[in-house]
């Protein structure tokens, strides 16, 4: 029971990381700026990786998106990679899951194959987490470390003189948002694998049962399948003297017609 | 590269009218606002009036109800029209722009033009 409570409580907290990794990736608010030096009105600049966007006082919003652009920084694409890798590998780690869940059955699937395939989800939910975090955490770095800003303050180009407008860079929702999912990512996968020993059949280890008679000698008995269970000549539950015989997990366990005393 | 380029200037009498128009062009991202500044001779350069992309305008009190600001951003340009000029209107306008280029899309950066001379005679 605490097993598939495990293994359920997992799937979940996956399936609420992949979806949030996703809504993260999606989200323009990865960087925000405000632009202080508007003299017309108080203008928002916010991005993502897909696309920037200006919001003004008035309400409107324009958004441009990146695609069309070929000379992205690296960095950038970085980040996206890390993000999607984790999306994949999230998506394939619950369709795994779905089958490995102990509350489903699916034909005649062996518990063993439960146990693997629960622990190769976990895995892929630990790898998507981590890129998540990864990811966010390497375009946290880019802001920080104002990675974006052009050295160059003020120069003269060829229309006359540019200058680099002084904007503060602030973490936007999204990475807060992929942090956290990430994070949950991660511990659905942890329970995923911790569910996966609990599944996992331990090898049956029958002992050898002694019998001990009334008198003076003593029979070894090898245990077989029909000493272990019970299962024998004895159909018809006779009374049948066992001689105080028992297993080592203390269940009773019946001679059959093979064994001599 | 990107250039502002300013045209429309001159020579005008007292009352008269003059358009100006300003041409953002070359490696664009996004534009953000567009607008005017002036520089008279011996002076400090002084905020016009300016447009942002979803059309919010302000004038400096000076040239309230005088000049209208307005902008094609299809085409990326501004301009301004400039009635019932007077001799103090007399300076070099500056087209302006915050903007972010195609090899910085996380980057804004404040673009002037070289100006374009306008002249009221009294």
């Known amino acids: 029971m605490a097993v598939t409570a495990c293994q359920g409580l997992g799937f979940v907290v996956s399936l609420i990381g992949i979806a949030g990794i996703i809504a993260a990736t999606c989200m323009d608010q990865w960087s925000t700026q405000d632009l202080y030096n508007n003299p017309v009105t108080a203008v928002f600049n916010y991005q993502g990786l897909w696309r920037s966007c200006v919001r003004e006082s008035s309400g409107f919003t324009e958004c441009r998106g990146y695609f069309t652009l070929l000379g992205l920084p690296a960095m950038l694409q970085a980040v996206r990679a890390l993000m999607i890798v984790g999306i994949v590998l999230g998506a394939i780690g619950l369709l795994v899951s779905i089958f490995a869940l102990k509350c489903i059955r699916i034909g005649s699937m062996e518990d063993s194959a439960k146990a693997n395939m629960t622990l190769t989800s976990g895995i892929m939910f630990i790898v998507s987490g981590l890129c998540a975090i990864a990811g966010v955490s390497v375009f946290a770095n880019m802001l920080v470390t104002n990675f974006w800003m052009s050295t160059a303050n003020m120069y003269t180009g060829m229309g006359g003189m540019v200058q680099t407008v002084q904007t503060r860079y602030t973490f936007g929702a999204a990475l807060f948002v992929g942090w956290v999912a990430g994070g949950l990512t991660l511990i659905g996968g942890v329970m995923m694998c911790i569910a996966c020993r609990g599944l996992a059949p331990e090898e049956t280890n029958y002992k050898a049962v002694s019998y001990h008679a009334s008198g003076h000698s003593v029979a070894y008995k090898p245990g077989g399948f029909k000493a272990s269970t019970g299962f024998g000549s004895n159909t018809k539950n006779k009374k049948i003297y066992d001689g105080g015989a028992r297993t080592e997990d203390e269940v009773q366990s019946y001679p059959s017609k093979h064994d001599y005393v | 590269a990107v250039q502002l380029v300013e045209s429309g200037g001159g020579l005008v009498q007292a009352g008269g009218s003059l358009r100006l128009s300003c041409v953002a062009s070359?490696?664009?991202?996004?534009?953000?606002?567009m607008g005017w500044y002036r520089q008279a001779p011996g002076k400090q350069r002084e905020w016009v009036t300016g447009?942002?992309?979803?059309?919010?305008?302000r004038y400096a009190d000076s040239v309230k109800g005088r000049f209208t600001i307005s902008r094609d951003n299809a085409k990326n340009t501004v301009y301004l029209q400039m009635n019932s000029l007077k001799p103090e209107d007399t300076a070099v306008y500056y087209c302006?722009?915050?903007?972010?280029?195609?090899?910085?899309?996380?980057?804004?950066?404040?673009?002037w033009g070289q100006g374009t001379q306008v002249t009221v005679s009294a």
């Open positions: 302006n722009s915050d903007l972010k280029t195609t090899s910085n899309v996380f980057q804004w950066y404040e673009y």
């Open positions: 070359g490696s664009i991202f996004q534009i953000n606002t």
């Open positions: 447009i942002t992309t979803g059309g919010t305008t």
